[in-house]
Interface confidence: medium
């Protein structure tokens, strides 16, 4: 919709909804940018170290900074802030109206693109959660740890997260499934999730079972890479690779942030005492201590910032969205106080932006990032964050401008390069995207070691006939983004048997295969009838997977949901399939007819998940010219026969016959997934 239907939500779901957002129907819980339409909760545990590291290269050397920052720059900052503070003041409010909360609606609902509100993006699932599924996430490494000051002015990046120099925002178990059509379109390509939330400690994160009944509170986690959970850290691997680089070290150690103004230095002992409580994890006591300091010293930026951090910590501890909204508001208050040290201002607004993203307040986060860039125009990393902010709301054009600007000033910025390449690829500027993606990944800069960049670099290279593609897939595999060079899906459950081609016996779904093969003519005839009478039900593939040709699909089920309208066109086929929950209940797949016309070539591509296997039943197969390659083995279809392959492996299709090819595609759960996993895995 365009809006959440709160009448449907309130009173029916309880405070914490297993799928963590606001969908109208639990079985229809689809996530858009981490949100759905119905529930009043959203999973996502904020990270342990939540505060962004300051951008060292941006800070003025300590010696150079006036004691109380009462120079022109400070005045500019203050006037800019006062101008902008009011524009965003309401964001933290949580207005409860008759038909539900509207203060800071969270995201677009995937049906009507209406604003939605979600009461809690912190998951309250039971602790016994299995952590088996790996999900590729989008990282932008965190730049300042939440404990950004040990002795108020110590450079925390040296203590806690020595090598980061970009803000981390990592997609946090929020799956963003678009509407059905879009998913039909996306289903054969890895789905790229937004950089919504901050880097999390994977071992603590739970994934929402997006499509399941609310009662299913145990969930499978999709981890950030294919390594075992224990190996996951908040600090992404590329930052570690950079530690030996003296330049990088120099960058990080350039300057300690100045967090105290003249007045705060006079109350440093009190601030230290309160901070010590927070550092020791005595959050409630720390909150009270900082509240008291704010009461006593309402103009103290550092006291206010401490209060914000405590609220932030408390929100994490209680998994409370309401508390986090308060923290976001308090970070804002820091910025509106007089005489705020530039470093503290930056930390506070960066953290605010990050937490806004965590809550799905993408637009609000973007406004905060815009303010940051206005306040600190020379900080490249903030511009990079701003670019991501634009990407998160689908504004590729503005993101592109931002990265062009960054690259005009710092042509070797790897983060800007990969993102710029990413945007070019999205615009189908395949050849142009390659050098940016390649050089960006090669830079090793924080935020560049992301599976999607390898995925798209390889894909771009394949499309221009560059054999180097597999070198990058290999590297992506080595760095933990892909299960193997061939198997490059990004939503994976670890440990599932991985082979490109399967026999019916190996799947265990022999009854389904038999039924399909016995009834193939019935299935074929219904498909042909739809082609004749309601051709419009066959929707063209528009995911840019084709080099050339004509390929359309008519979908009966997707995300485990029957399309009633479609089933009117193929009623017997739908009835036949109802007996097989391994396919009708496969929320990570579809059941559909696929028609491909002569002269079609589908680029090598990879499906999004290893959780399904794909059956192809031949319905109308020309004598010659039609073939499918999965990994390094190529096969042909036969009428009335089922082929089974794992589409998380690279596959490619050719249709060089003289007439159309019609097949019936039936996705099934990977046989090794447990019933619990099948219930809990979020839909794709």
């Amino acid at each position: 919709f365009d809006l959440v239907d709160y009448e449907e939500v309130l009173g029916k779901l309880g405070i914490y909804d297993a799928d963590g957002d606001g969908d109208f129907d639990v079985d229809d819980a689809k996530v858009l940018l981490g949100l759905k339409e119905r529930s009043t909760s959203e999973p996502a545990v904020p990270p342990e170290e939540a505060e962004p590291h300051t951008e060292p290269e941006e800070q003025v050397p300590v010696e150079a900074e006036p004691q109380n920052i009462e120079d022109e720059a400070k005045e500019q900052i203050q006037s800019l802030l006062h101008e902008m503070v009011h524009a965003e003041h309401v964001e933290g409010e949580d207005l409860q109206q008759e038909d539900g909360p509207t203060g800071e609606p969270q995201q677009e609902d995937d049906e009507f693109l209406m604003a939605t509100d979600v009461d809690d993006r912190f998951e309250t699932l039971e602790p016994e959660v299995s952590h088996e599924e790996t999900e590729h996430s989008y990282h932008v490494e965190e730049t300042v740890s939440q404990d950004c000051n040990q002795d108020m002015e110590e450079m925390m990046s040296e203590q806690e997260n020595p090598d980061s120099s970009e803000p981390v925002v990592e997609d946090e178990r929020l799956h963003h499934d678009t509407d059905d059509v879009t998913y039909q379109v996306y289903e054969e390509q890895a789905v790229y999730e937004p950089l919504e939330n901050e880097g999390i400690e994977i071992t603590e994160v739970t994934a929402p079972p997006e499509d399941n009944p609310v009662e299913d509170s145990q969930v499978i986690v999709e981890e950030v890479s294919i390594f075992p959970v224990e190996e996951q850290q908040e600090v992404p691997p590329e930052t570690n690779r950079k530690t030996d680089d003296p330049e990088q070290k120099a960058k990080v150690k350039k300057k300690k942030p100045k967090l105290l103004n003249k007045f705060d230095k006079t109350i440093k002992a009190e601030l230290d005492a309160a901070e010590k409580l927070r550092k020791r994890g005595k959050i409630e006591e720390a909150v009270n201590a900082f509240k008291e300091l704010v009461r006593k010293y309402p103009q103290s930026p550092r006291a206010r910032y401490g209060k914000a951090q405590c609220e932030d910590d408390l929100a994490e501890k209680r998994r409370s969205n309401e508390v986090l909204r308060g923290a976001i508001e308090t970070y804002q208050e820091v910025a509106s106080l007089p005489d705020v040290p530039a470093d503290l201002l930056k930390l506070s607004l960066k953290r605010r932006s990050d937490r806004q993203q965590f809550l799905g307040h993408m637009r609000g986060s973007l406004l905060t990032l815009q303010r940051l860039v206005q306040l600190f125009p020379n900080d490249t990393s903030l511009k990079n964050d701003l670019g991501v902010g634009y990407l998160l709301i689908g504004d590729n054009d503005n993101a592109k401008k931002v990265y062009e600007e960054v690259l005009s000033v710092t042509p070797n910025d790897g983060f800007a390069k990969v993102h710029y390449g990413f945007i070019l690829k999205a615009q189908n500027k395949i050849a142009e995207s390659i050098p940016y993606l390649k050089e960006g990944i090669e830079s090793g800069d924080p935020g560049t070691d992301d599976g999607r960049f390898y995925f798209h670099l390889g894909d771009a290279m394949q499309r221009v006939g560059n054999k180097e593609a597999y070198k990058w897939y290999e590297l992506g595999h080595k760095r933990g983004h892909f299960a193997s060079v061939w198997q490059r899906s990004l939503y994976n459950v670890n440990g599932l048997k991985a082979q490109p081609w399967w026999t019916p016996k190996e799947t265990g779904y022999t009854e389904l295969v038999k039924s399909l093969e016995r009834n193939w003519k019935l299935i074929r005839d219904e498909g042909l009838a739809v082609m004749d009478k309601a051709k419009g039900l066959f929707l063209p593939e528009d995911e840019n997977l084709r080099e050339k040709g004509d390929w359309s699909q008519f979908t009966l089920w997707q995300q485990g949901r029957r399309n009633e309208n479609a089933c009117k066109g193929a009623p017997k086929t739908c009835t036949l399939l109802e007996k097989f929950p391994e396919t009708t209940g496969c929320r990570r797949g579809q059941i559909k007819y696929s028609i491909m016309h002569p002269g079609t070539h589908v680029w090598p591509h990879t499906g999004p998940t290893n959780c399904r296997l794909r059956m192809h039943l031949g319905l109308v197969i020309p004598k010659e010219g039609c073939k499918i390659r999965c990994a390094n083995e190529t096969k042909t279809w036969e009428e009335g026969k089922v082929l089974i392959f794992d589409d998380s492996f690279e596959h490619e299709v050719w249709q060089d016959a003289s007439s159309f090819r019609l097949i019936f595609i039936v996705d099934v759960w990977h046989p090794e997934l447990t019933p619990q996993q099948r219930r809990s895995l979020p839909a794709i």
Epitope: D2, L113, A115, T178, V181, A426, R452
Partner: antibody, heavy 127, light 106 residues
């Protein structure tokens, strides 16, 4: 090019039904939620109803709830508004409008306003 | 959510700056769009989500505000800008338009 064309409206007596249609062309109709918006003579715009991209969900303004039904046929690229129990206050120009959306690998999609409108069709409810 | 727009009519000469106003009875955050309608024509979207210009919207149009108060502006009125302007919220059901502000030539 991208366009929406409403069917002819007409004059109808109070209490009688009328069905409006809106033919879409130049874009993937089945990917977009669609709205009906109306405008009484000399008055402002009034939102009427919306239907999801696949026709599975709809919402209505209080003034038309229970009387009007929005639907779509994606195979025909057509949006409908079935108006029953018409009243004189339903008189006006009825517009169909598309919900703009964009997608990319980061955000999947994002709202762009009601970005394409039909030319409007006049409905007059009078005895 | 009730939307109010002021003034009902704004009479200005060309090349002058026009500032409109839209208020909402509840916080709609940034979920507010502006539409322009000329006599006998369908509306067209100018900005969505407060400040984002739609494709084809000239740079002289800008939007600002958040929560309950919004003020779009036209930096320098062109002859083609004289029209009725509507704000619309999508923060909660039912979606609603404001009553409109007519910008006419002084």
């Amino acid at each position: 090019q991208v366009q929406l064309v409403e069917s002819e409206g007409g004059v109808v007596q109070p209490g009688r039904p009328l069905r409006l249609s809106c033919a879409a062309s130049g874009f993937t109709f089945s990917s977009h939620a669609m709205h009906w918006v109306r405008q009484a003579p000399g008055k402002g715009l009034e939102w009427v109803a919306v239907v999801s991209h696949d026709g599975s969900r709809d919402r209505y303004a209080g003034s038309v709830k229970g009387r009007f039904t929005i639907s779509r046929d994606n195979s025909k690229n057509t949006l409908y508004l079935q108006m029953n129990s018409l009243r004189p206050e339903d008189t006006g120009v009825y517009y169909c409008a598309r919900v703009g959306r964009s997608s990319n690998w980061f955000s999947r999609y994002y709202y762009y306003g009601m970005d394409v409108w039909g030319q409007g069709t006049t409905v007059t409810v009078s005895s | 959510i009730v939307l109010t727009q002021s003034p009902a009519t704004l009479s200005l000469p060309p090349r002058e700056r026009a500032t409109l106003s839209c208020g909402t009875s509840q916080n709609v955050s940034h979920y507010l769009a502006w539409y322009q309608q000329k006599p006998g024509r369908a509306p067209r979207v100018l900005t969505y989500d407060v400040a984002n210009r739609a494709a084809g919207t000239p740079a002289r149009f800008s939007g600002s505000g958040s929560g309950t108060d919004f003020t779009p502006a036209i930096s320098s009125l062109e002859p083609e800008d004289f029209a009725v302007y509507y704000c619309q919220q999508r923060s909660n059901w039912p979606q609603a338009f404001g009553p409109g502000t007519k910008v006419d030539i002084k």
